[in-house]
C-alpha cells in the first residue's frame, strides 16, 4: 500500500481542501473510525488500484486517524493497512469530543492505559490533572493518543491553553474492577444438542500456574463419572483449560454443568456454570407473531422479519405465490437469515422500492431433517391517492354536476367541500359540514371499482347541485391511509356568461366551506 502524501502525520489548515491518494495491488479503501469515507476508487491499466479521498472545508473535528486498507481486509497482515494521522489546528475546537466508552476506563489489573484527551494542534502544551486538582501529573503525552501510564482509581481531566483561554477536557473516570484472583470462564461448543451427539465443555482459568478443577454435571450425580482432560493453552501464559467431553449424549444429560476452580497457595476459588439442553430431536419454533395481512407502500422499501428458534441450523426459503424467491440481481429483493444467538434466527425479506406486482401471498419456510415450520401472510401494496379528474357539467335538467374521479389503495375516502363567499373562505370563515338538515340542495352519488391488475380502487363521485345562484368553489378531497390529494373547480350559475367565469381569480377562493362526505347522500342548505 502506498499513501500520497506519505505522512505518517500531516498538519492541515482549517477551511482548506486536501487530497489523499492510496494505491495498492487490490481494491483499496479509506476508513476513519471504522467507517468507509466517501471517496473515488479507480483501477489503472497496470492492474493497480487507487482511492482518492478529498477532504473539504476542514475543521478541527477532522483531526484524527485515517486508514487505507484493502477492501476485503479479512486476515490481512499489519503492513497491509496504512495509518495516517491528520491534525487540523482549530482554535474553536478545544479537546476532541469523546464518546462514553472513552470517558469511563475500567481495569481488572494493574496495567498501562491511555487517557484519550486529544487536541487539534500538535504544538499545544497539554497537562493532566486530577479532576479538581491544579497540580500537573508527570505522565507522558502523545498528541495523537493522549496520556499513557499506570493510573489510580480516580477521575482525571486534561488542560491546555488556546490563545489566552484555558480549556478543560471532559473528566475521565478510571475504575479498577474488583475481580477474584481466579477468573474462570466456561463455554460449550453447543449448549443445545440432540441425543446421540457430543457434549463438549471448556473451563479456562487465566493468570494462575497451579489450579485444581472440579466438574459437577448430571451424570456425576448418578455415579457415572467422566474423566476431564486438562491442558495449557501454549500461546497464552498461564491459561489453563479443562475439557469435559461426553460422547453420545442422553436426555438425562440435560442440566447444569459447573466448573469449580481452587488455588491452594492463597486459598482462592471461583466457579462458573452453564446449562446444557439435550433434545430428543431437532426443532424449529416461531417466536412472536406476524399478522396475516402485511402492508407496504408503493415505491418505498419494506423489510418483513420473522424470528424463530431452531436446532440444528435450518434451511430457510421464501416463496411468493408458491414460487421460490432468491436475491434478485437488480437488487429489488434481498433475503437474509442471521443467527442472532446459538439457536435463534432472524430471517428478513427486504423489498426495495416496492412495486404493485409485489403484492401477493408470501411464505417463509424453515426446515431441517427433524422439523419444519412455515409462516404465511398476504402483502398488500398501499398506493397514495390521487385525484385523476375533476370536471363540471350542465345537463339539460337545469342542475349542475361536478364529477370527481380518483384512485388509491386502500380504498379512498371522498370529501366534497364547497365555498360560497369566495373572498372570505377559508381564511375568515371556518368550513361548515353539510348533512345536518333535510333540504335537498345537492345530491351525491359514489361508485367504487376495484382494478385487479393495478390492485387499487377507483372512486367516481358525482355531486349534483340544484340551485347555483352565485359562483361556488367546489373541492374534491380524496384520502386514504397513506395520503391525500385534492382538486378544486369553480361552478358558476347558468346565467353568468362564459367570459365572467374566466375572470374569477384565485383570490376569490374563500368563504364558507361545506363538506360533503360519502356518508351524506344529500347536500344540505346552510344559513
Amino acid at each position: 500500500l502506498v499513501i500520497t502524501p506519505p505522512g505518517p502525520e500531516l498538519i492541515l489548515n482549517v477551511s482548506s481542501t486536501f487530497v489523499l491518494t492510496c494505491s495498492g495491488s487490490a481494491p483499496v479503501v479509506w476508513e476513519r473510525m471504522s467507517q468507509e469515507l466517501p471517496q473515488e476508487m479507480a483501477k489503472a491499466q497496470d492492474n493497480t488500484f487507487s482511492s482518492v479521498l478529498t477532504l473539504t472545508n476542514l475543521t478541527g473535528l477532522d483531526t484524527g486517524e485515517y486508514f487505507c486498507t484493502y477492501n476485503d481486509s479479512r486476515g490481512l497482515e499489519p503492513d497491509e493497512r496504512k495509518r495516517l494521522y491528520i491534525f487540523v489546528p482549530d482554535p474553536t475546537v478545544g479537546f476532541l469530543p469523546n464518546d462514553a466508552e472513552e470517558l469511563f476506563i475500567f481495569l481488572t489489573e494493574i496495567t498501562e492505559i491511555t487517557i484519550p484527551c486529544r487536541v487539534t494542534d500538535p504544538q499545544l502544551v497539554v497537562t493532566l490533572h486530577e479532576k479538581k486538582g491544579d497540580i500537573a501529573l508527570p505522565v507522558p503525552y502523545d498528541h495523537q493518543r493522549g496520556f499513557s501510564g499506570i493510573f489510580e482509581d480516580r477521575s482525571y481531566i486534561c488542560k491546555t491553553t488556546i490563545g489566552d483561554r484555558e480549556v478543560d477536557s471532559d473528566a475521565y473516570y478510571v475504575y479498577r474492577l474488583q475481580v477474584s484472583s481466579i477468573n474462570v470462564s466456561v463455554n460449550a461448543v453447543q449448549t443445545v444438542v440432540r441425543q446421540g451427539e457430543n457434549i463438549t465443555l471448556m473451563c479456562i482459568v487465566i493468570g494462575n500456574e497451579v489450579v485444581n478443577f472440579e466438574w459437577m454435571y448430571p451424570r456425576k450425580e448418578s455415579g457415572r463419572l467422566v474423566e476431564p482432560v486438562t491442558d495449557f493453552l501454549l500461546d497464552m501464559p498461564y491459561h489453563i483449560r479443562s475439557i469435559l467431553h461426553i460422547p453420545s449424549a442422553e436426555l438425562e444429560d440435560s442440566g447444569t454443568y459447573t466448573c469449580n476452580v481452587t488455588e491452594s497457595v492463597n486459598d482462592h476459588q471461583d466457579e462458573k456454570a452453564i446449562n446444557i439442553t439435550v433434545v430428543e430431536s431437532g426443532y424449529v419454533r416461531l417466536l412472536g407473531e406476524v399478522g396475516a395481512l402485511q402492508f407496504a407502500e408503493l415505491h418505498r422499501s419494506r423489510t418483513l422479519q420473522v424470528v424463530f428458534e431452531a436446532y440444528p441450523p435450518p434451511t430457510v426459503l421464501w416463496f411468493k405465490d408458491n414460487r421460490t424467491l432468491g436475491d434478485s440481481s437488480a437488487g429489488e429483493i434481498a433475503l437474509s437469515t442471521r443467527n442472532v444467538s446459538e439457536t435463534r434466527y432472524v430471517s428478513e425479506l427486504t423489498l426495495v422500492r416496492v412495486k404493485v406486482a409485489e403484492a401477493g401471498h408470501y411464505t417463509m419456510r424453515a426446515f431441517h431433517e427433524d422439523a419444519e415450520v412455515q409462516l404465511s401472510f398476504q402483502l398488500q401494496i398501499n398506493v397514495p391517492v390521487r385525484v385523476l379528474e375533476l370536471s363540471e357539467s350542465h345537463p339539460d335538467s337545469g342542475e349542475q354536476t361536478v364529477r370527481c374521479r380518483g384512485r388509491g389503495m386502500p380504498q379512498p375516502n371522498i370529501i366534497w367541500s364547497a365555498c360560497r363567499d369566495l373572498k372570505r373562505c377559508p381564511r375568515e370563515l371556518p368550513p361548515m359540514l353539510l348533512g345536518n338538515s333535510s333540504e335537498e340542495e345537492s345530491q351525491l352519488e359514489t361508485n367504487v371499482t376495484y382494478w385487479e391488475e393495478e390492485q387499487e380502487f377507483e372512486v367516481v363521485s358525482t355531486l349534483r347541485l340544484q340551485h347555483v345562484d352565485r359562483p361556488l368553489s367546489v373541492r374534491c378531497t380524496l384520502r386514504n391511509a397513506v395520503g391525500q390529494d385534492m382538486q378544486e373547480v369553480i361552478v358558476v350559475p347558468h346565467s353568468l356568461p362564459f367570459k365572467e367565469q374566466k375572470l374569477i381569480s384565485e383570490e376569490d377562493l374563500g368563504g364558507e366551506q361545506k363538506l360533503i362526505s360519502e356518508e351524506d347522500l344529500h347536500h344540505h342548505h346552510h344559513h
Epitope: P97, D99, A100, F104, F106, D170, Y173, L177
Partner: antibody, heavy 127, light 107 residues
C-alpha cells in the same frame, strides 16, 4: 467551565403545562446520561426522570409517569422536561444533573453519581 | 420501588466532632449508593459514590462504608463548612431514590 443552567420555571395553574430547559456547556453533552431532580419547598430531593446519551432510553418516578416527559437535543446541548396536567404537588425547584452512568461492563451497570448540577428553576402550581 | 431511610433526621454537633449518618435500603442494593451535601438555596454536591469512593476534590475527612442494605457516611472531624443537609441516594436499574435527608446543625 462545566455548567448546567435551567430555565422555564414559573407560576402555572393546576392542569396547565410548562417546559423546562437545561443548557449544558463545558463538556461533551452527548456522552452522558442526564437527570431531572426536584425539591419541594422545605422538603428533600426527589429524582424525577433520566435519559441516556442518544435519547433512546428514559426512566421516570411513578408519580410523574404519563404527565412529565424528558427529552434532549444533543446538537444544542440541551435537556428538556415537558410538564403537562400539573398538580399542586409538582411545586418545587427543578434541578438538572449530569448522571454518570458508564456503558455496561459485562453483567454490571456501574454508577458514579450525579456530579454536576444546575442552580435550579422554580415551578409553582397554584390557582 | 426501593425505599431509603436515613437516620437521624437532625443531628446537633460541634466543630471537631466525629459524625456518623446511617442510610438503610428496603432491599439489597449491593454498593450502588451515593452521598450528597446540600446547603440552603444551593444545588446538591456529590461527595461519595459506589458507597465508599470519594469524589475528586472532596476532603478526606468524609468517608463512606457499607453494602447490601446498611450504609454510613462519616465525617471524622466536623468543620464549620460541613453544617448542611446530607442525602443518600440509591441507584438500581437506572431508577434512583433519595433518602429523606439528615440535617447537621451547630450544637
Amino acid at each position: 467551565e462545566v455548567q448546567l443552567v435551567e430555565s422555564g420555571g414559573g407560576l402555572v395553574q393546576p392542569g396547565g403545562s410548562l417546559r423546562l430547559s437545561c443548557a449544558a456547556s463545558g463538556f461533551t453533552f452527548s456522552s452522558y446520561w442526564m437527570s431531572w431532580v426536584r425539591q419541594a419547598p422545605g422538603k428533600g430531593l426527589e429524582w424525577v426522570a433520566n435519559m441516556n446519551q442518544d435519547g433512546s432510553e428514559t426512566h421516570y418516578v411513578d408519580s410523574v409517569k404519563g404527565r412529565l416527559s424528558i427529552s434532549r437535543d444533543n446538537a444544542k446541548k440541551s435537556l428538556f422536561l415537558h410538564m403537562n396536567s400539573l398538580r399542586a404537588e409538582d411545586t418545587a425547584v427543578y434541578f438538572c444533573a449530569r448522571d454518570l452512568v458508564p456503558p455496561r461492563q459485562d453483567d454490571y451497570y456501574y454508577y458514579f453519581g450525579m456530579d454536576v448540577w444546575g442552580h435550579g428553576t422554580t415551578v409553582t402550581v397554584s390557582s | 420501588d426501593i425505599q431509603m431511610t436515613q437516620s437521624p433526621s437532625t443531628l446537633s454537633a460541634s466543630v471537631g466532632d466525629r459524625v456518623t449518618i446511617t442510610c438503610r435500603a428496603s432491599q439489597s442494593i449491593s454498593d450502588w449508593l451515593a452521598w450528597y451535601q446540600q446547603k440552603p438555596g444551593k444545588a446538591p454536591k456529590l461527595l461519595i459514590f459506589k458507597a465508599s469512593t470519594l469524589e475528586s476534590g472532596v476532603p478526606s475527612r468524609f468517608s463512606g462504608s457499607g453494602s447490601g442494605t446498611e450504609f454510613t457516611l462519616t465525617i471524622s472531624s466536623l468543620q464549620p463548612d460541613d453544617f448542611a443537609t446530607y442525602y443518600c441516594q440509591q441507584y438500581n436499574s437506572y431508577s434512583r431514590t433519595f433518602g429523606q435527608g439528615t440535617k447537621v446543625e451547630i450544637k
